[in-house]
Interface confidence: medium
């Protein structure tokens, strides 16, 4: 049999070897495709089959606009003038070249020594699905699950049957390297079909700023508050990327998700204690602030009344 590859939407002609110049009953096409249940028989005298395929006077089979459902096996059996039976067998596959792939949400800047999303490569409208691959400085980038992580997703359009591919690249660039050039290419995996390439992106690589010291700011100043007042603790640190901040009271971590602000409304004596914050930086490890002592006393500065906080986002959880 012969393998045929045809582009979706284009006509396909399959010739029937040995067909007489003026076909008689002695020519028959059989097809088994996504449109048929098992084998469908077409003969020259038969009506055109749903305008999908018809036998031409010379015995060839014409599919005016081939689609995904026309993938399958096509067989012709003809008897030539000498009475000898000649068979033709075709295995038909279809393809669709997608639009040019593109990198969406490209990073303009990467931070060394920490994982960074470079961008998401998107290809729309392919058949078969094909593959996306990433390149660094023109060379294939092999995911290793650590410094180079690729997350892939393939979706099929429910009506057209065409595929959309997405590939998200996350890298951990080394310090002191050159400016990298990332690109992505789509390949259908068919012979003689060149890959389609995205425009390259060149994000800058920024050295991570080591934490310059961590400050714990307390309101009211001094940390002394009257019962029923509000205490706001803010952990200030200049580092890139921003670290995660956890809170400690009397040496014990508080049951809160990371946040740079800790709000204590309507304080009572049970809130008294030594508070500190810990900044956890991916490339520099944890760093603890100097502690502050929160005291609740009748003579202390009047803390902000609990009902007067304006909802400015000061809270005990980070997004």
């Amino acid at each position: 049999g012969q393998n045929i590859t045809a582009r979706i939407g284009e006509p396909l002609m399959l010739s029937c070897k040995g067909a007489p110049k003026k076909p008689t009953q002695k020519l028959e096409w059989k097809l088994n495709t996504g449109r048929t249940e098992a084998w469908k028989v077409l003969s020259p005298q038969g009506d055109p089959w749903d305008s999908v395929a018809r036998i031409l006077p010379n015995g060839s089979l014409l599919l005016p606009a081939i689609g995904i459902v026309d993938e399958g096996t096509f067989r012709c059996r003809a008897t030539n003038r000498l009475g000898k039976e000649v068979k033709s067998n075709y295995r038909v596959r279809v393809y669709q070249i997608p639009g040019k792939p593109e990198i969406v949400n490209p990073a303009s800047e990467l931070t060394a020594n920490v994982p960074n999303k470079v961008g998401t490569c998107v290809s729309e409208g392919s058949y078969p699905a094909g593959t996306l691959s990433w390149h660094l400085d023109g060379k294939p980038l092999i995911p290793d699950g650590k410094g180079t992580v690729v997350k892939e997703e393939t979706r099929r359009h429910p009506e057209t049957g065409l595929f959309t591919l997405r590939s998200e690249l996350t890298v951990t660039p080394a310090q002191g390297g050159t400016t990298p050039t990332y690109s992505c290419s789509f390949s259908l995996g068919l012979p003689r079909r060149r890959p389609l390439n995205t425009a390259p992106i060149q994000p800058r690589v920024r050295e991570p700023l080591p934490p310059e010291g961590i400050q714990l700011l307390v309101e009211p100043e001094g940390g002394t508050v009257a019962p029923g007042g509000t205490v706001t603790l803010t952990c200030a640190i200049s580092a890139q990327p921003p670290p995660q901040i956890h809170w400690i009271k009397d040496g014990t971590p508080l049951p809160l998700a990371p946040s740079p602000v800790l709000l204590l409304p309507e304080v009572g004596h049970e809130d008294e204690g030594i508070y500190s914050c810990v900044a956890t930086h991916p490339s520099h490890g944890p760093q603890e602030s100097p502690p502050v002592n929160i005291r609740v006393t009748e003579t202390g500065d009047e803390g902000q009344a609990a009902g007067s906080v304006d909802g400015s986002g000061l809270g005990t959880l980070a997004l």
Partner: antibody, heavy 117, light 109 residues
Amino acid sequence: QVQLQQSGAELVRPGTSVKVSCKASGYAFTNYLIDWVNQRPGQGLEWIGVINPGSGGTNYNEKFTGKATLTADKSSSTAYMQLSSLTSDDSAVYFCARRRVDTMDYWGQGTSVTVSS
Amino acid sequence: QAVVTQESALTTSPGETVTLTCRSSTGAVTTSNYANWVQEKPDHLFTGLIGGTNNRAPGVPARFSGSLIGDKAALTITGAQTEDEAIYFCALWYSNHWVFGGGTKLTVL
């Protein structure tokens, strides 16, 4: 006085979503966290997650990631929990509770969600 | 996931002192578990009693107190009253989530 008023009982079809509300009154909404907890018929309590109404920050029990979505509307002092792709396993009474750092003090009256075809 | 275990039922008399406990499958309960105690009365009426191991919630009578006893968290009711008949749940914090115990049904006869 502090009150958490939850929305009424829901009877919903499998595969659909439901949104339960929890309206807070009697205190400064953004000063406290709102935890969500469920109780299945004849079972104990299970923590779903928490939202900080001031910042919108959330923290979920891994088991409920993708199932529950917590939001809050500061202007109406209301917290919401949306449950998606419901199955009969999600039939339970759902509670909101106010939390001050480490203490869940006030609780809503509960919202019964029944998933049935 | 950790399992939190409580006595399934306890009975006491009015005026008596009763202690409910809360054990963790991961080892000793510590202040880092921020034990909470919650009371459930009929019709899903929940009230927070204790948080952070030993901090009474607002408006909770002084007869309720929280502590650590040995390797467990404990809720002590000193001078139980008939209205204390309820189910009591404890909750423990494990790094990033809370786990509740199965509850203790307290009967005050």
